[in-house]
Interface confidence: medium
Amino acid sequence: RGVFRRDAHKSEVAHRFKDLGEENFKALVLIAFAQYLQQCPFEDHVKLVNEVTEFAKTCVADESAENCDKSLHTLFGDKLCTVATLRETYGEMADCCAKQEPERNECFLQHKDDNPNLPRLVRPEVDVMCTAFHDNEETFLKKYLYEIARRHPYFYAPELLFFAKRYKAAFTECCQAADKAACLLPKLDELRDEGKASSAKQRLKCASLQKFGERAFKAWAVARLSQRFPKAEFAEVSKLVTDLTKVHTECCHGDLLECADDRADLAKYICENQDSISSKLKECCEKPLLEKSHCIAEVENDEMPADLPSLAADFVESKDVCKNYAEAKDVFLGMFLYEYARRHPDYSVVLLLRLAKTYETTLEKCCAAADPHECYAKVFDEFKPLVEEPQNLIKQNCELFEQLGEYKFQNALLVRYTKKVPQVSTPTLVEVSRNLGKVGSKCCKHPEAKRMPCAEDYLSVVLNQLCVLHEKTPVSDRVTKCCTESLVNRRPCFSALEVDETYVPKEFNAETFTFHADICTLSEKERQIKKQTALVELVKHKPKATKEQLKAVMDDFAAFVEKCCKADDKETCFAEEGKKLVAASQAALGL
């Protein structure tokens, strides 16, 4: 069964149960429910999942049984709407239950919360975790799925199954190791960091589909897959793009069973046709399903064919350019993007999309002109400044990163972005700037040819986090403008923002700069976040403060924390020295 051929099934739920198997079926339904009802207790979700699973089994036994012919949205929506505390817990989301499908599902989707009010996940002691794992492995792993899914309502569900498999493997191995902590903690840290990155990448895919439409996502996929599979024919890349779009549309739309099923079909297709796709797939295709799909998604770019001719011949010099464009605009532009991307693994996907947009705009104008060829003859010259802009930006920022190191580079970005958009909440500015700053350690180590795709495509993911968080509570017209005008120009839009001269500085509040002894017991990362929170607040109070002034205050602050954490009476030190620090800072900044 291909991704595109949907055989007629009497019962969709029975079909998916049989395709996916009971274990994956239950896991995916749990993820789906947790992503919709993010505040519900674990036990409630497990109960709902068990009820759905038992129902699915009756449909497997007899596809004609009552209600087995209902759509998955109807079945799942009906089940979610049985939750007794829906109105108290979710407020207006309960109104979704008064709607019919497909409006009801759309309503649930609109109420997904990217920043749910949930407590931070605290990691228990290793022995406590190992005991819980051994006592009830199934519940332990379900709890993992539940906790990740409710905090990341757009997490790519089939990929979360892969994370859960690795999570289980880590506990299986490490809970019987001599030094459990040394074995387990680095693995859990790695899963946590990879999980956050995976969630953010998927959030951009869903935003692309939901805010900018299928055409935008397909363009992104053509560019990325053409870079990855430069030996594949255009028709092959187009097939993969169409299938991949279907998979992500399903997952972003909450159709997790269909998404996981279709992703498995796509992996199967790719592996059966690897000779016409890429020489790099062999190892991936020998792995079990979840690992295989993950591996394919991360596979390195194949080598470019050696004999690729100049692009100008087909897309500038040919007398058929306007004819080909007129006959099938999207196909011709798709071919242009394919041909350009397969020749440029050194460009970011967003840059390739900017070039394709420029080419499209030029053809729109020139193919209506008196002399089309004369009009579009220099179109490739228009690409030069578009290519140089990210190249120069990356060069400058990598130099700054190498000079400052990650923490101070993050601080420089915190100041830069707080001055650009000071209305944005402090936690969001800290989170986003810290992530922007990670581009340095992630990408600056790469050679020139890999820097731009690494850096600019990563920045697109991070800026999307800012966009989705800001959309929940919009406070800045400038953020809204950069986020909504053009998906591919978000980063240049934010880069071009200068200091917001209209901003009225925040009133000074000493409480914001009052610290206590508990800071001493925090991890290095948490301590950094405290200091960076203070830095953002300083800039919001004094947006015109110079780098030097801010550096002096932050150096004093670091010395103050270090001194008081070494003191015998820490709390008294923080109280007395803190007052002095606030006064000195106010004086230094002229507050």
Epitope: S238, K239, V331
Partner: nanobody, 119 residues
Framework: EVQLLESGGGLVQPGGSLRLSCAAS????????MLWVRQAPGKGLEWVSV????????YYADSVKGRFTISRDNSKNTLYLQMNSLRAEDTAVYYC????????????RGQGTLVTVSS
């Protein structure tokens, strides 16, 4: 040797339908993307539709979108073009061809079948 043999053309009234077939041999049909092109009297070749080796996705020229449907039967090594709501401007010789990796052109094409739309 690659051979492509089109059939199914003929005279039809505006608004009518025709189904073209193309029998392929001499190459591995089920690993080749295929397309239909056409040439109206006194005009150049015009691209009509492409189909991937697996049967999906399919692509259409803007001028035929919603009226023409391309399909294939890999077990019979045959390509099809279902043409509905035909218009006078669809009059042309229709060719099936192998779709290559580059350009909106092709490696091989058949002898063609003439479709005339006239009242």
């Amino acid at each position: 040797e690659v051979q492509l043999l089109e059939s199914g053309g003929g005279l039809v009234q505006p608004g009518g339908s025709l189904r073209l077939s193309c029998a392929a041999s001499g190459f591995t049909f089920d690993t080749s993307s295929m397309l239909w092109v056409r040439q109206a009297p006194g005009k150049g070749l015009e691209w009509v539709s492409v189909i991937h080796q697996s049967g999906t996705p399919t692509y259409y020229a803007d001028s035929v979108k919603g009226r023409f449907t391309i399909s294939r039967d890999n077990s019979k090594n045959t390509l099809y073009l279902q043409m509905n709501s035909l218009r006078a401007e669809d009059t042309a010789v229709y060719y099936c061809a192998k779709f290559p990796s580059r350009k909106m052109k092709f490696d091989y094409r058949g002898q063609g079948t003439l479709v005339t739309v006239s009242s």
